[in-house]
């Protein structure tokens, strides 16, 4: 006789997901000699762990407590990038610009970016039909609880000058429900960070429009402002030529505004 | 069985560019990383780069920066190495090459090579 | 860069007796993790080199026992307890510790 199987919203757990974290593990250690020390069956079983047997709408952060032990991991404090709406220009620029790091960039970041996964409670299972959808079924998710937790633990790493990469094509630019606006702006230090520069990236081509001025960035300055920490914010106005210009600063058309 | 096959052997002008493929199978092209490197005639061994498949992010050697690019068609499962600004002292035998993983841990040796094309700059 | 130094750069071997090479690295390639990161490789004419030994000592799968390698940080030894005639080639040390990997110069084993 089948078992019910609860249908959630969304869509389910991402296909080769075992196979695919503990290869991404290895790939990891393989790429990030200093992280060498990580056993990645360990990781593997920290990670299952967090989520296996239990309901998928009932996933707190100490759950992942092990897992984020066991991925604890040094980045420079002073050389973080945020992003909000904008994961493949921040990823782009982190490429060229090695010596910054965005969270996905880190071990467990890399690990889970773009997968979805849960279980089922009391089961052993991996659900590969459905998981909760934040929205639509709840928040306490295992995929949402995951990315809150790392992120909050990243943001709080920060120190000095934190730089944040923002979409100014979107509606909101800074949106006061995405990561970045409900985890990561709460969870700067202000006895360790100074300053939260946003890049604002534009989209269209003739845009020249400066949407520092916009309300939801007059919105974020407010908020940082708050936390006594200081708030710049740059246009760059061409994405493309922003990163030529990282790869070839010493191009002599990059002299000019971006 | 894991087998990396390259393409054919190219004979091009200095200032030319070339692009070697290296066609993987028998495993799951995304889980490893892919490893270029050269080798001059009678000469030794020289590491040109990695990339990852999944993600496209990429490592070159500091003496080959700006002149080298590698890519992934993860349909075709398939890695490209492009040289651009061919000089002479670029005729070597390219190689892919991947690692194997012992237990959930990467060797740290390269396991598994393509058998090499040869690349000829010549005026 | 980790720069990797082999001895003797030929050798010349007769056929059942014991051959050995000598391969240095200007630093230590012990990692935190208890591993040491050093390869042993063989090259034969016309062909990709083919691993023989990862982490100083572990050897390759499929490789014969007679291959064996030890050291210590900087200071690496491959053995061959027996030379047959299909062990001629050249044979590069590699350090994985850290990026950029790095090879030895090369070791050619001639049979007498």
């Known amino acids: 006789v089948p078992r019910w199987r609860q249908q959630w919203s969304g869509p389910g757990t991402t296909k080769r997901f075992p196979e695919t974290v503990l290869a991404r593990c290895v790939k990891y250690t393989e790429i990030h000699p200093e992280m060498r020390h990580v056993d990645c069956q360990s990781v593997w079983d920290a990670f299952k762990g967090a989520f296996i047997s239990k309901h998928p709408c009932n996933i707190t952060e100490e759950d992942y407590q092990p897992l984020m032990k066991l991925g604890t991991q040094t980045v420079p404090c002073n050389k973080i990038l945020l992003w909000s709406r904008i994961k493949d220009l921040a990823h782009q620029f982190t490429q060229v610009q090695r010596d910054m790091f965005t969270l996905e960039d880190t071990l467990l970041g890399y690990l889970a970016d773009d997968l979805t996964w849960c279980g089922e409670f009391n089961t052993s299972k991996i659900n590969y039909q459905s998981c909760p959808d934040w929205r639509k079924d709840c928040s306490n998710n295992p995929v949402s609880v995951f990315w809150k937790t790392v992120s909050r633990r990243f943001a709080e790493a920060a120190c000095d000058v934190v730089h944040v990469m923002l979409n100014g094509s979107r509606s909101k630019i800074f949106d006061k429900n995405s990561t970045f606006g409900s985890v990561e702006v709460h969870n700067l230090q202000p006895e360790k960070v100074q300053t939260l520069e946003a890049w604002v990236i534009h989209g269209g081509r003739e845009d020249s429009r400066d949407l520092c001025q916009d309300p939801t960035i007059k919105e974020l300055e407010s908020i940082i402002s708050k936390r006594n920490i200081q708030f710049s914010c740059k246009n760059i106005y061409r994405p493309d030529k922003f990163l030529q210009c990282v790869k070839n600063p010493e191009d002599s058309s990059c002299t000019s505004e971006i | 069985q894991v087998q990396l096959v390259q393409s054919g052997a190219e004979v091009k002008k200095p200032g030319a560019s070339v692009k070697v493929s290296c066609k993987a199978s028998?495993?799951?092209?995304?889980?490893?990383?892919m490893h270029w490197v050269r080798q001059a005639p009678g000469q030794g061994l020289e590491w040109m780069g990695w990339i990852d498949p999944e993600y496209g992010s990429t490592d070159y050697a500091q003496k080959l920066q700006g002149r080298v690019t590698m890519t992934t068609d993860t349909s075709t499962s398939t890695a490209y190495m492009e040289l651009r600004s061919l000089r002479s002292d670029d005729t070597a035998v390219y190689y892919c090459?991947?690692?194997?993983?012992?237990?959930?841990?990467?060797?740290?040796?390269?396991?598994?090579w393509g058998q090499g094309t040869l690349v000829t700059v010549s005026s | 860069d980790i720069v990797m130094t082999q001895t003797p750069l030929s050798l010349s071997v007769t056929p059942g007796q014991p051959a050995s090479i000598s391969c240095q690295s200007s630093?230590?390639?012990?990692?935190?993790?208890?591993?040491?990161?050093l390869n042993w490789y063989l090259q034969k004419p016309g062909q990709p080199p083919q691993l023989l030994i990862y982490?100083?000592?572990t050897r390759a799968a499929g490789v014969p026992d007679r291959f064996s390698g030890s050291g210590s940080g900087t200071d690496f030894t491959l053995k061959i307890s027996r030379v047959e005639a299909e062990d001629v080639g050249v044979y590069y040390c590699q350090q994985f510790l850290e990026y950029p990997p790095t090879f030895g110069q090369g070791t050619k084993l001639e049979i007498k």
């Open positions: 982490w100083m000592s």
């Open positions: 028998g495993y799951t092209f995304t889980d490893y990383i």
């Open positions: 090459a991947r690692v194997a993983i012992i237990t959930t841990v990467a060797s740290g040796g390269f396991a598994y």
């Open positions: 630093e230590s390639l012990l990692h935190s993790n208890g591993k040491t990161y």
